[in-house]
């Protein structure tokens, strides 16, 4: 990164937390699933959100940790091992596998801080990489060489 | 969010920026594309990263803005309008559409700050939602009701 001059929030501690709360991945995406109208099943719907119309359909699973920022993360979970047939939208096609697309999300864990003499002094944020699944993708199986 | 006690970074201004730099979506994902081995084309490869094996293959396009945090964002760009046939991996099947999966990424823009009397006083971060495409997904076309 190029160097940026320091910015000017009024309270550094609160700002760090505030920014973090808002800068993380807001999944589920723009078009929310409507579970009552689109029951979770191994089929590709002809309407509804992208994750239910996909031939590698998926649902979102909440991962909540009150000692982590963001406290709420959503993981995609594939509803089928294979892809759904484009012909019918309901039968599976064994020529394709439904695979998760991952990324490493940076998260921050709340940890007790220790002062200069080892005394407990509030909480610090500890940065960690955390694997999150974004979606399921229909792929041709790998050819074993 | 539940209330967290304030945390204890040493310098608030630097910490805000440091946390932001690290908390955004690190795309391209875990398995990097190798463009020389897998030329970008409308076909589903039998090896390589997920975005080249997908029947809705995509490439990543860099979006760099030095006045934004994160400065680098990557957008998925579909390589085919339709899905690639699972039978061959090399010709299109018009029964399926290759659609982008979007999410609203929170970004922060660097803006000049103004002091109490309107004087220029360094830079502030302005939070904005920014639409990013994560991947391409093979979907059954919507049925128009």
């Amino acid at each position: 990164y190029s160097h940026w001059p320091s910015c000017c929030p009024s309270k550094g501690q609160d700002t760090s937390e505030e920014l973090l709360r808002w800068s993380t991945v807001p999944v589920p995406p723009l078009e929310p699933a409507r579970p009552n109208r689109h029951p979770e099943s191994c089929r590709a719907s002809e309407d509804g959100p992208l994750n239910s119309r996909a031939i590698s359909p998926w649902r979102y699973e909440l991962d909540r940790d009150l000692n982590r920022l963001p406290q709420d993360l959503y993981h995609a979970r594939c509803l089928c091992p294979h892809c759904v047939s484009l012909q019918t939208g309901s039968h599976m096609d064994p020529r394709g596998n439904s695979e998760l697309l991952y990324h490493n999300q940076t998260v921050f864990y709340r940890r007790p801080c220790h002062g200069e003499k080892g005394t407990h002094k509030g909480y610090c944020l500890e940065r960690r990489l955390y694997r999150v699944s974004l979606a399921c993708v229909c792929v041709r199986p790998r050819v074993m060489g | 969010y539940s209330h967290w006690p304030s945390c204890c970074p040493s310098k608030g201004q630097d910490t805000s920026e440091e946390l932001l730099r690290w908390s955004t979506v690190p795309v391209p994902p875990l398995e990097p594309a190798r463009p020389n081995r897998h030329p970008e084309s409308c076909r589903a490869s039998e090896d390589g990263p997920l975005n080249s094996r997908a029947i809705s293959p995509w490439r990543y396009e860099l979006d760099r803005d030095l006045n934004r945090l994160p400065q680098d964002l990557y957008h998925a760009r579909c390589l085919c309008p339709h899905c690639v046939s699972l039978q061959t991996g090399s010709h299109m099947d018009p029964r399926g559409n290759s659609e982008l999966l979007y999410h609203n990424q929170t970004v922060f823009y660097r803006r000049p700050c103004h002091g109490e009397k309107g004087t220029h006083k360094g830079y502030c971060l302005e939070r904005r939602l920014y639409r990013v495409s994560l991947a391409c997904v093979c979907v059954r076309p919507r049925v128009m009701g």
Partner: antibody
Framework: QVQLQESGPGLVKPSETLSLTCTVS????????WSWIRQAPGKGLEWIGF???????NYNPSLKSRVTISVDTSKNQFSLKLNSVTAADTAVYYC???????????????WGQGTLVTVSS | DIVMTQSPASLAVSLGERATINCKSS????????????LAWYQQKPGQPPNLLIY???TRDSGVPDRFSGSGSGADFTLTISSLQAEDVAVYYC?????????FGQGTKVEIK
């Protein structure tokens, strides 16, 4: 009735490139997929790869690094190039057509008569 | 790749008798979406190219005598010649067109006993 005819040199030296052409008569090369298949003496059939009229190709992974198939729609022909040949590439080489029905490729029909290519110095 | 295995490698049958050739695929070639088996049978006479006999595992190509029939589903298939004729002496191949790379069985040679 569509007919296919292979042509090209019957003898190729080791490490050189085998080049064959298939001429399609009695019909257009468009709207179909065109394959090369080979058969070593006394052996079974091995699919090499296919091309469609637009030039989209698909190769057998076992030969992919050495194969190029191209099409010339103006001449109603498609061609095979196989480089770095060895004695193991000695075979009868056939061209054949595949129809596409409901967006999927089907069986091979018809086939060319085949041409024997011998790899020898 | 889908591996196709034929048995027997060769078969000697008396004229007018039944000849049966088996073909197994390493994975199913039945597509449940259209309930079709992506399997074809070819006949190859000496010095000639293969000639299509049967497709979709059981549909005879036009002009193929009805003594030839195909059966089976999923991963196990059979080609039957109900009453062998002299002109049926040939090598027979099964082939899957379920997914690339297209693959053939190693062939079954049918002779007259």
């Amino acid at each position: 009735q569509v007919q296919l005819q292979e042509s090209g040199p019957g003898l190729v030296k080791p490490s050189e490139t085998l080049s064959l052409t298939c001429t399609v008569s009695g019909g257009s090369i468009s709207s179909y997929f065109w394959s090369w298949i080979r058969q070593a003496p006394g052996k079974g059939l091995e699919w090499i790869g296919f091309i469609d009229y637009s030039g989209s190709t698909n190769y057998n992974p076992s030969l992919k690094s050495r194969v190029t198939i191209s099409v010339d729609t103006s001449k109603n022909q498609f061609s095979l190039k196989l480089n770095s040949v060895t004695a193991a590439d000695t075979a009868v080489y056939y061209c054949a057509r595949q129809e596409i029905i409901n967006f999927e490729l089907n069986w091979f029909d018809p086939w060319g008569q085949g041409t024997l290519v011998t790899v020898s110095s | 790749d889908i591996v196709m295995t034929q048995s027997p490698a060769s078969l000697a049958v008396s004229l007018g008798e039944r000849a049966t050739i088996n073909c197994k695929s390493s994975q199913s070639v039945l597509y449940s979406s259209n309930n079709k088996n992506y399997l074809a049978w070819y006949q190859q006479k000496p010095g000639q190219p293969p000639n299509l006999l049967i497709y979709w595992s059981s549909t005879r190509d036009s002009g193929v005598p009805d003594r030839f029939s195909g059966s089976g589903s999923g991963a196990d298939f059979t080609l039957t010649i109900s009453s062998l004729q002299a002109e049926d002496v040939a090598v027979y191949y099964c082939q899957q067109y379920f997914s690339t790379p297209w693959t053939f069985g190693q062939g079954t040679k049918v002779e007259i006993k």
